[in-house]
Interface confidence: low
């Protein structure tokens, strides 16, 4: 349904608030470096114009492309070139070329200050003072620093931080009631992000059909009773949900998420039986809870996979007519008994059936060729299952800090040329994993772990991608989007890398080690653990396990020393000398 | 043997209304969406409406919209089009067809064919 003017269009359907919150949010994840101030006042004469569109659509200019409107307004920014350097080039292109342009120069990790938490008195006075202000800047914070963040779900949190404030700035210990809420909200929303950034690299990388075949399996499982027909059209629809927001379109995203939302509560009958409770709630929360909604349960009769996938004698001809239509329906027929797969085994599954068809469909005899292609999967089901089953073991008995530390040890060996912080970064993460998923029972194991080892590898693989430097991880990121675990996995020691030149100074720590929380104490660890590997790769565990138990022990006596500096600085070189005797350096 | 049998169709004045019933045998009904299609003359074989198996989904040409109704009764082996407000341009060889794998209600996703019943709107 086309719009005289796209601006006042979507200003309509949003309303004021969300319209300005979804345009600020647009503008930080493109203009990253830019001040607060300048991206308020972007935003207010967006949305000045935009009224003058609500009020008259055939007014000047109100007839242009949102991306026009937006990029012309990006493009006003004076400090562009010495911010941006390469960046202000792309303001001599044209749309749509001007908007892939500014979306390419979107950085992942972008050099900002880390986000220090004031003191709680500081942040309600601040709240409280000027509230619009407090969350635009909540808003502008995050999506800078996550500039695929999905941008409706960022509305969710700022919500939620809201409410976080509005009730704990006036409790009796304000900071018990404040704290815990905002530490979830950080790290939900760490999560949050990591997931969707795997969304647009699924899109971006892959294609529209990897994006369609991943929601086709998880909305089969999801909704096991809908029908093929229903979860077609609502991966249709979710594709163009996400495509939009990955594309920077994030006003016709949040628009359409709010119609898919509606759509799926209107028809819950023929969904699932579990979107009752989610239906009830306001916009922001409903389309959250449907996101993140329970499998449903499986129907009680359904029928072997075989009959119409193996034993039919049309498996061909039904393969020949309609490509991927029969092969989304294998898919979903797969996907919708088997909860207990995580989604890229059931792609890896969808895949393997699928070349068996290219081959067998072209053989003289196709039925008897895949006659046994079932078989073909049973070891798919296994690896992953063993491996999860291994880890868990391993995570029980080392728990998550040291099983965090087993894994930075695995992944400096496989990949040593990666940086530091980057592996530090997303060992940690694949660490999670234990406590995220150990303690479910069996069924749900897999789903939980492999699916959350996607969305850490891609973090690699996104920040690898900025500043290549090893083969064999842009190998494993680029050839194939649900191989990713299966191929770092396989990954043995590097036996090409020549290990780093020891340095003195990387092993020098000071006495500001001790005011650090808990957190940044291990990573100040587990950074001088992969630097060690890097030094020694053929370091055994135990040499390894040794020298981060004196590394633990000099912290500790150290931090208890009354002149701690002087501590760390004379300890510190007997330890430097005791680890490269331990280390054979 | 698969046997759709298409009936309901005949002459009627422009505004009026029909139902065409298509009765399915020699498949299970329940495991395939449903379709109606319609050829006039010198004019190429075009989807009109189609149902999913439980019924639970719906497509509609945009030329029928509110004014045709597909239902089904999996009891019954069938599939009904009510036919409202008809026009002139309505007039067409009506013809009812099975998928096994549907989901965008394309021609080719159809199996099965019935032989059609042959709908007049007159003016």
């Known amino acids: 349904d086309a719009h005289k003017s796209e601006v006042a269009h979507r200003f309509k359907d949003l309303g004021e608030e969300n319209f300005k919150a979804l345009v600020l949010i647009a503008f930080a994840q493109y203009l990253q470096q830019c001040p607060f101030e300048d991206h308020v006042k972007l935003v207010n004469e967006v949305t000045e114009f935009a009224k003058t569109c609500v009020a008259d659509e055939s007014a000047e200019n109100c007839d242009k492309s949102l991306h026009t409107l937006f990029g012309d307004k990006l493009c006003t920014v004076a400090t562009l070139r010495e911010t941006y350097g390469e960046m202000a080039d792309c303001c001599a292109k044209q749309e749509p070329e001007r908007n892939e342009c500014f979306l390419q120069h979107k950085d992942d990790n972008p050099n900002l200050p880390r986000l220090v938490r004031p003191e709680v008195d500081v942040m309600c006075t601040a709240f409280h003072d000027n509230e619009e202000t407090f969350l635009k800047k909540y808003l502008y914070e995050i999506a800078r620093r996550h500039p695929y963040f999905y941008a409706p779900e960022l509305l969710f949190f700022a919500k939620r931080y809201k409410a976080a404030f509005t009730e704990c700035c006036q409790a009796a210990d304000k900071a018990a009631c404040l704290l815990p809420k905002l530490d979830e909200l950080r790290d939900e929303g760490k999560a949050s992000s990591a997931k969707q950034r795997l969304k647009c690299a699924s899109l971006q990388k892959f294609g529209e059909r990897a994006f369609k075949a991943w929601a086709v399996a998880r909305l089969s499982q999801r909704f096991p009773k809908a029908e093929f027909a229903e979860v077609s059209k609502l991966v249709t629809d979710l594709t163009k949900v996400h495509t939009e927001c990955c594309h920077g379109d994030l006003l016709e995203c949040a628009d359409d998420r709010a119609d898919l939302a509606k759509y799926i509560c209107e028809n819950q009958d023929s969904i699932s039986s579990k979107l009752k409770e989610c239906c009830e709630k306001p916009l922001l929360e409903k389309s959250h809870c449907i996101a993140e909604v329970e499998n449903d349960e499986m129907p009680a009769d359904l029928p072997s996979l075989a009959a119409d996938f193996v034993e039919s004698k049309d498996v061909c001809k039904n393969y020949a007519e309609a490509k991927d239509v029969f092969l989304g329906m294998f898919l979903y027929e797969y996907a919708r008994r088997h909860p207990d797969y995580s989604v890229v085994l059931l792609l890896r599954l969808a895949k393997t059936y699928e070349t068996t068809l290219e081959k067998c469909c072209a053989a003289a005899d196709p039925h008897e060729c895949y006659a046994k292609v079932f078989d073909e999967f049973k070891p798919l089901v296994e690896e992953p299952q063993n491996l999860i089953k291994q880890n868990c073991e391993l995570f029980e008995q080392l728990g998550e800090y040291k099983f965090q530390n087993a894994l930075l040890v695995r992944y400096t060996k496989k990949v040593p040329q990666v940086s530091t912080p980057t592996l530090v970064e997303v060992s940690r993460n694949l660490g999670k994993v234990g406590s995220k998923c150990c303690k479910h029972p069996e069924a749900k194991r897999m789903p939980c772990a492999e699916d959350y080892l996607s969305v850490v590898l891609n973090q690699l693989c996104v920040l690898h991608e900025k500043t290549p430097v090893s083969d064999r991880v842009t190998k494993c990121c680029t050839e194939s989007l649900v191989n990713r675990r299966p191929c770092f996995s396989a990954l043995e020691v590097d036996e090409t890398y020549v290990p780093k030149e020891f340095n003195a100074e990387t092993f020098t720590f000071h006495a500001d080690i001790c005011t650090l929380s808990e957190k940044e104490r291990q990573i100040k660890k587990q950074t001088a653990l992969v630097e060690l590997v890097k030094h020694k790769p053929k370091a055994t565990k135990e040499q390894l396990k040794a020298v981060m138990d004196d590394f633990a022990a000099f912290v500790e006596k150290c931090c208890k020393a009354d002149d701690k500096e002087t501590c760390f600085a004379e300890e510190g070189k007997k330890l430097v000398a005791a680890s490269q005797a331990a280390l054979g350096l | 043997d698969v046997q759709l049998v298409e009936s309901g169709g005949g002459v009627v004045q422009a505004g009026g209304s029909l139902r065409l019933s298509c009765a399915a045998s020699?498949?299970?009904?329940?495991?395939?969406?449903m379709g109606w299609f319609r050829q006039a003359p010198g004019k190429e074989r075009e989807r009109v409406v189609s149902?999913?198996?439980?019924?639970?989904?719906?497509y509609y040409a945009d030329s029928v919209k509110g004014r045709f109704t597909i239902s089904r009764d999996n009891a019954e082996n069938t599939v009904y089009l009510q036919m409202n407000s008809l026009k002139p341009e309505d007039t067409a060889t009506y013809y009812c067809?099975?998928?096994?794998?549907?989901?965008?209600?394309?021609?080719?996703?159809?199996?099965?064919w019935g032989q059609g019943t042959l709908v007049t709107v007159s003016s």
């Open positions: 067809a099975a998928a096994r794998y549907w989901a965008t209600g394309s021609e080719y996703e159809f199996d099965y």
């Open positions: 149902i999913s198996r439980g019924g639970g989904y719906t």
């Open positions: 020699g498949l299970t009904f329940s495991s395939y969406a």
